[in-house]
C-alpha cells in the first residue's frame, strides 16, 4: 500500500446481518477510515473493549473509525457495535505492515496489492508489531511457574532479539532448567521459576537501522509455609448399618511433609475430656501423606461400638489442623427392608 | 472494592524519623508492586519509593535514597515507609498506592500529612 | 525538576476541547506505557487513562489519551466545570525502576 493510500471499507452502508471478520494489514503512517452502518445511523467504534472518543488522532465518529496516521500501537482488535445494541457489526483486526514505496511515483496504487508486483521496502528500524501483548510489565509468579516474555517485533531488514538479565547478556547456562528462547515467537520461556530468577529482563531488538528495547521484571514468590488445609467436609458424618464396612475420607494439602494421625473419641470414667481439658482419643492409625491409603481410615464390619466421633489431625512443621466427623451405627434391619435396599450403608 | 489506609502521619522536628502504614483491603496484596508518592504544599506528585511483591527489591527516589526505607507485610496487608533524618523538603501529603501490572498506580490512598519543622 | 514535562497550565470555556502535553525520553515515555491522572482539589490523584489510550470504567469518553515517540497527549472535548483539576501524566521510568510524573497542568474552565 502506498503511504498516502488510505484503507477503506467502503461504501459506508448498513452491513449485511452476518458480522464481517476480517484482518486488514496497514501501512505505518497511513490513514485508515473505516466505515460501519450508515453515517446518520453509525455504529460506535470500540478497541480493545474500549469506545473510540469522536475526536483525536484516532477516533470514532458517525459510524467512521478514523486513524490520521498509523503508528504501531494503534494495531489490534476494533469493533463496531450497532447503535444502542450489542450488536456486532464489524470486527477487525489491524496489523502493523511496513511501509512501502513505489519505484514509480506515476504507477497505479490499487497495483500495490497484487503481490506479484515487485516492491522495493525502505529500510526501517524495528518497532513493536503487538504492543498490546507487551502491557503487563511487572510479572510476580509462584515459585514453579512457568514464566514467558514476549517482544514481537519487525523492521527492514528482519530485526534480530536478544535478552539482557539485570543489564547483562542471558543465555540462561546458569540456570536450572535453562531457558527456550523462541526467535520466530520473540520470546523467553523459564520453566520452573525459583527466587533466583527475580530481576528486570530486557529484549534487546535490532537491526542495521536502530533499536528498541522493553524491560520485564520478575518477582518469584515463595509458597508461604502453612499448616495443613483439610479439605472441607471431610471426613463426613456416616451411619452405617452393623456389620458393614465404612470408609472416612480425610484430604490433605500441604507444601511442607504433613504427618497424619486417624484418632477415635474415647469415654473413660464417664468422661470425655481429661484434667487438661484434651479429649481423650485412642489413635488408629498414623502415617506420612506418603504411605499408600493414609488418608482413608477403613473400618471393616463395624458394631454399635464403632460409632462415635472419629478425627483426623494433620500436623507439619508449622501447625497441627484437624476436622471430625461422627460415625452413626443402625441396629441389622429386619429382612424385608434389607431386601428392598441391599445398599445398606449411606452418607449424611 | 480496594482500599488503602495511611497512618501514621504527623508533625516532626528535622532530624526526626516517622514510620507511616498503609493498611490495604478489598484485593490479594501479596502479587502486587507497591509504592509512596509524595506531593509537597502546592506542588506535584512526587515518586517517593517501590518495592516488590516479595519485599525482597526495593527502589528508591534520589531525593529520599538512603533516609527512607520501603518494606511490606504480606501476611499483615500492610505496607510501610520508615523516614529517617527528616528535613523540611520532605513535608508533604504522603500516598500509597497500588501498582498495576502495567507500571501504573490503579489504586491510591487518601494520603497522610507529614509535616517537618522545628 | 519532574522527568516529564507538562505545561503548567491549560484553559478552556465549557463545550470546548482542550488537549495538554506531555514530553519525556526512551527510558520512560520512549519505551513505556504514558498514564494519565486527575486530581481534583484536596483530593487525592485518580487514574483517568492508563497504556496510552485506555479509560478505567467509569471515566467519560470525553478523556482520550495518545502516546507518539517520546511524548503523550492528554484531550477533553465537551469540557465542563467539574473538569477543573490538575492533571498529571506518568510512565514508568526503567533506569529508575519505578514511575516519573510530569510537574502537573492546572486546567481552568472559563
Known amino acids: 500500500l502506498e503511504a498516502s493510500e488510505e484503507v477503506e471499507l467502503e461504501p459506508c452502508l448498513a452491513p449485511s446481518l452476518e458480522q464481517q471478520e476480517q484482518e486488514l494489514t496497514v501501512a505505518l503512517g497511513q490513514p485508515v477510515r473505516l466505515c460501519c452502518g450508515r453515517a446518520e445511523r453509525g455504529g460506535h467504534w470500540y478497541k480493545e473493549g474500549s469506545r473510540l472518543a469522536p475526536a483525536g488522532r484516532v477516533r470514532g465518529w458517525r459510524g467512521r473509525l478514523e486513524i490520521a496516521s498509523f503508528l504501531p500501537e494503534d494495531a489490534g482488535r476494533y469493533l463496531c457495535l450497532a447503535r444502542g445494541s450489542m450488536i456486532v457489526l464489524q470486527n477487525l483486526t489491524l496489523i502493523t505492515g511496513d511501509s512501502l514505496t513505489s519505484s514509480n511515483d506515476d504507477e497505479d496504487p490499487k497495483s500495490h496489492r497484487d503481490p506479484s508486483n515487485r516492491h522495493s521496502y525502505p529500510q526501517q528500524a524495528p518497532y513493536w508489531t503487538h504492543p498490546q501483548r507487551m502491557e503487563k510489565k511487572l510479572h510476580a509468579v509462584p515459585a514453579g511457574n512457568t514464566v514467558k516474555f514476549r517482544c514481537p517485533a519487525a523492521g527492514n531488514p528482519t530485526p534480530t532479539i536478544r535478552w539482557l538479565k539485570d543489564g547483562q547478556a542471558f543465555h540462561g547456562e546458569n540456570r536450572i532448567g535453562g531457558i527456550r528462547l523462541r526467535h520466530q515467537h520473540w520470546s523467553l520461556v523459564m520453566e520452573s521459576v525459583v527466587p533466583s530468577d527475580r530481576g528486570t529482563y530486557t529484549c534487546l531488538v535490532e537491526n542495521a537501522v536502530g533499536s528498541i528495547r522493553y524491560n520485564y521484571l520478575l518477582d518469584v514468590l515463595e509458597r508461604s509455609p502453612h499448616r495443613p488445609i483439610l479439605q472441607a467436609g471431610l471426613p463426613a458424618n456416616t451411619t452405617a448399618v452393623v456389620g458393614s464396612d465404612v470408609e472416612l475420607l480425610c484430604k490433605v494439602y500441604s507444601d511442607a511433609q504433613p504427618h497424619i494421625q486417624w484418632l477415635k473419641h474415647i469415654v473413660i470414667n464417664g468422661s470425655s475430656f481429661g484434667a487438661d481439658g484434651f479429649p481423650y482419643v485412642q489413635v488408629l492409625k498414623t502415617a506420612d501423606i506418603n504411605s499408600s491409603e493414609v488418608e482413608v481410615l477403613y473400618l471393616r464390619n463395624v458394631s454399635a461400638e464403632d460409632a462415635g466421633e472419629y478425627t483426623c489431625l494433620a500436623g507439619n512443621s508449622i501447625g497441627l489442623s484437624y476436622q471430625s466427623a461422627w460415625l452413626t451405627v443402625l441396629p441389622e434391619e429386619d429382612p424385608t427392608w434389607t431386601a428392598a435396599a441391599p445398599e445398606a450403608r449411606y452418607t449424611d | 472494592e480496594v482500599q488503602l489506609l495511611e497512618s501514621g502521619g504527623g508533625l516532626v522536628q528535622p532530624g526526626g524519623s516517622l514510620r507511616l502504614s498503609c493498611a490495604a483491603s478489598g484485593f490479594t496484596f501479596s502479587p502486587y508492586w507497591m509504592g509512596w508518592v509524595r506531593q509537597a504544599p502546592g506542588k506535584g506528585l512526587e515518586w517517593v519509593s517501590v518495592?516488590?511483591?516479595?519485599?525482597?527489591?526495593?527502589d528508591y527516589a534520589d531525593s529520599v535514597k538512603g533516609r527512607f526505607t520501603i518494606s511490606r507485610d504480606n501476611s499483615k496487608n500492610t505496607l510501610y515507609l520508615q523516614m529517617n533524618s527528616l528535613r523540611a523538603e520532605d513535608t508533604a501529603v504522603y500516598y500509597c498506592?497500588?501498582?498495576?501490572?502495567?507500571?501504573?498506580?490503579?489504586?491510591w490512598g487518601q494520603g497522610t500529612l507529614v509535616t517537618v519543622s522545628s | 525538576q519532574s522527568e516529564l514535562t507538562q505545561p503548567p497550565s491549560a484553559s478552556g470555556t465549557p463545550g470546548q476541547r482542550v488537549t495538554i502535553s506531555c514530553s519525556g525520553g526512551?527510558?520512560?515515555?520512549?519505551?513505556?506505557?504514558a498514564h494519565w491522572y486527575q486530581q481534583l482539589p484536596g483530593t487525592a490523584p485518580k487514574l483517568l487513562i492508563y497504556?496510552?489510550?485506555q479509560r478505567p470504567s467509569g471515566v467519560p469518553d470525553r478523556f482520550s489519551g495518545s502516546k507518539s515517540g517520546t511524548s503523550a497527549s492528554l484531550a477533553i472535548s465537551g469540557l465542563r466545570s467539574e473538569d477543573e483539576a490538575d492533571y498529571y501524566c506518568a510512565a514508568w521510568d526503567d533506569s529508575l525502576s519505578g514511575p516519573v510524573f510530569g510537574g502537573g497542568t492546572k486546567l481552568t474552565v472559563l
Open positions: 497504556n496510552n489510550n
Open positions: 498506592a497500588r501498582v498495576h501490572p502495567a507500571g501504573h498506580n490503579d489504586h
Open positions: 526512551y527510558s520512560n515515555m520512549g519505551s513505556n506505557y
Open positions: 518495592i516488590w511483591p516479595s519485599g525482597g527489591t526495593t
